[in-house]
Interface confidence: medium
């Protein structure tokens, strides 16, 4: 990633965290971690569309995009749009929706993020070729089983000892930014020199997000696909494709707190390779039937197969989902979901990468690009043996005709009964800041 992309990733996380609604009393400011970045980069080089089973106590989000190169705002957008489906007070996600990416982004106690990307001519587990894979790792872990992402309350009212409030986030006292003097900008003309401190908001190295995930995790395989013009697309279960509407502009986007927050696109959760029940297949694909079961726009668009349906620019996202408590890692128990839920059981880490233990026998509905709002309907997949996959569609909110449609994947697991929409700040579609 370029310096700009790193900063953009970090600052978008911090902006999203600062803007949570209800407000957070204990939200930590996040900063970039080069060790995590190196770890993420090393895994990205493996070109596997699945989570890193060696990641230990690190959270992980995945994103991939075809052809045009990395698009950090789009990645963030896809990870974050799930806020629409998450209810903080109930700690629930709307049935059939994903919320894990969002909860990682706003997990209050995560402080560090590191991301790396790699261009993969072939991404294992995805039919598309020439894909840029983004891996982000987080520490400390987020999505802890039975825990809410953050405590609701007056911003910074529950900052830990040794932290102070900055832009509604708890920032460590004595952090690199604080160690510096106030910013000064001295303008000089040939015969003029003066110094004056500018606004007190200090600026320094990127802060960062980190949502870590211990070795035992409840994660779902799910798929998500969006194309610029086609609402129904065939894809594999673990893949998530979303057309990147504007060409990649991550390097043209602001390198800091990008307030032109991305518009909302589909996100997708990947299977945890740490668990036996939801192992990512090395070669096994679970295709979505060519005909989707519901088109959420009045204008029906025929489904297409990958060969002719995918726009040159697509993206995929993946996230690790709910964690058991750190103390419970070694004995995380499988929990049966409510009837309306689709989730995977938790088992000790025993990887059987060749097995896909959840079968997909129902596909999500599709949505066309012209829909103005997120559809409330979704279709979940029935799974065998208590393990499940799910597919559903979500659509960018009021994005206009130039935005892609989306079929997104479910991300859910025990510890959270995913439920209704959370009234979070609805961010408008992305107009990349400073695009020229």
């Amino acid at each position: 990633l370029t310096d700009e992309e790193k900063r953009l990733m970090v600052e978008l996380h911090n902006l999203y965290r600062a803007q949570v609604s209800p407000t957070a009393s204990d939200m930590l400011h996040m900063r970039w971690d080069e060790e995590l970045a190196a770890f993420a980069k090393a895994y990205a080089r493996q070109c596997v569309w699945g989570h890193n089973k060696e990641r230990g106590r690190r959270g992980e989000n995945l994103f991939a995009i075809t052809d045009e190169g990395m698009d950090v705002p789009l990645a963030m957008e896809e990870w974050h749009h799930e806020r629409e489906h998450y209810n903080l007070s109930a700690a629930t996600c709307s049935p059939g929706q994903m919320c894990g990416h969002y909860t990682q982004v706003v997990w209050a106690k995560t402080e560090r993020i590191g991301c790396g990307s790699h261009f993969c001519e072939k991404l294992q587990g995805v039919e598309e070729t020439n894909i840029e894979l983004l891996v982000c790792n987080y520490e400390p872990p987020g999505n802890v089983k039975g825990k809410r992402p953050y405590q609701e309350g007056t911003p910074c009212s529950q900052c830990p000892s040794g932290y102070h409030c900055k832009n509604s986030l708890c920032e460590p006292i004595g952090s690199p930014e604080d160690a510096q003097d106030l910013p000064y900008l001295v303008t000089e003309a040939p015969s003029f020199r003066a110094t004056e401190a500018s606004d007190s908001r200090k600026m320094g190295t990127p802060s960062s997000l980190a949502t870590g995930i211990p070795a035992f995790l409840v994660t779902e395989v799910s798929g998500s696909l969006a194309t610029k013009a086609l609402p129904a697309v065939e894809t594999q279960a673990p893949t998530s494709l979303a057309t990147k509407d504007p060409p990649s502009m991550a390097t043209e986007a602001p390198p800091c707190v990008t307030t032109e927050v991305p518009s909302i696109l589909a996100a997708h959760s990947l299977p945890s390779l740490d668990e036996e029940p939801v192992t990512f297949p090395k070669s096994t694909h679970v295709p979505i039937p060519k005909s989707a079961d519901k088109v959420t726009d009045k204008t029906k668009v025929p489904s297409r197969s990958p060969e002719n349906s995918l726009d040159p620019k697509m993206s995929l996202t993946g996230a690790r989902e709910l964690l058991p408590h750190a103390q419970e890692e070694a004995e995380a128990e499988a929990e049966l979901p409510p009837s309306s839920e689709v989730l995977a059981s938790v088992f000790p880490a025993q990887d059987k990468p060749g097995e896909l233990q959840a079968t997909l026998d129902h596909t999500g509905h599709t949505s066309s690009k012209s829909l103005p709002n997120f559809p409330n309907t979704s279709a979940t997949a029935n799974a065998t043996g208590g393990r499940a996959l799910a597919l559903q569609s979500s659509l960018p909110g009021a994005e206009g005709p130039d935005k892609p449609s989306v079929v997104s994947g479910l991300n859910s697991g025990p510890g959270h009964v995913w439920g209704p929409l959370l009234g979070l700040l609805l961010l408008p579609p992305l107009v990349l800041a400073g695009i020229f």
Partner: antibody, heavy 112, light 104 residues
Amino acid sequence: GGGLVQPGGSMKLSCVASGFTFSYYWMNWVRQSPEQGLEWIAEIRLQSNDYPTHYAESVKGRFTISRDDSKNSVYLQMNNLRPEDTGIYYCACRYADYFDHWGQGTTLTVSS
Amino acid sequence: VMTQSPAILSVYPGEKVTMTCRASLSVSYMHWCQQKPGSSPKSWIYATSNLASGVPARFSGSGSGTSYSLTISRVEAEDAATYYCQQWSSNPFTFGSGTKLEIK
């Protein structure tokens, strides 16, 4: 301080920054005049992209923005100055799509 | 084009004041800066509703699309300044003409 320049003349402004990691930030020049109010002039981005630059239409071809990260400095070379270029010139850094910090400004007067 | 109104706002301390900024085209976010006489502008509110560091909680921002506002719940003497809205949803970065807040 400030400078008086005749129309058609040139001047180079400098801005020295401290207190933040200069190389991480996009540096801008904004000018202010009673007639035009606040007006964005130019921006230079980061080394990682070979320092791309952008200009307001009103100064394209006449002004050049540059930076020296080793000196925490950004510059504005202004050529073929016009009376309407008169104003207070601020350097400003941005880490997003708004300006986080502004310099104290220097006044440029273009008059014969 | 960014149009701010009113151009001048004269209020007593303790009053609630609201100034507006209208964009000719829809923008995703609005930012506000404060400028006091003889000083350079300061970032004041970013991303429509987020207060910059050090900005008193009596300030708030809201809006969407083409209409945005900055509100001060109880004006204090130190709030006397000119407030500019600014956007970069479209090229180039543009500023409003400013609302001058006077305290009686």
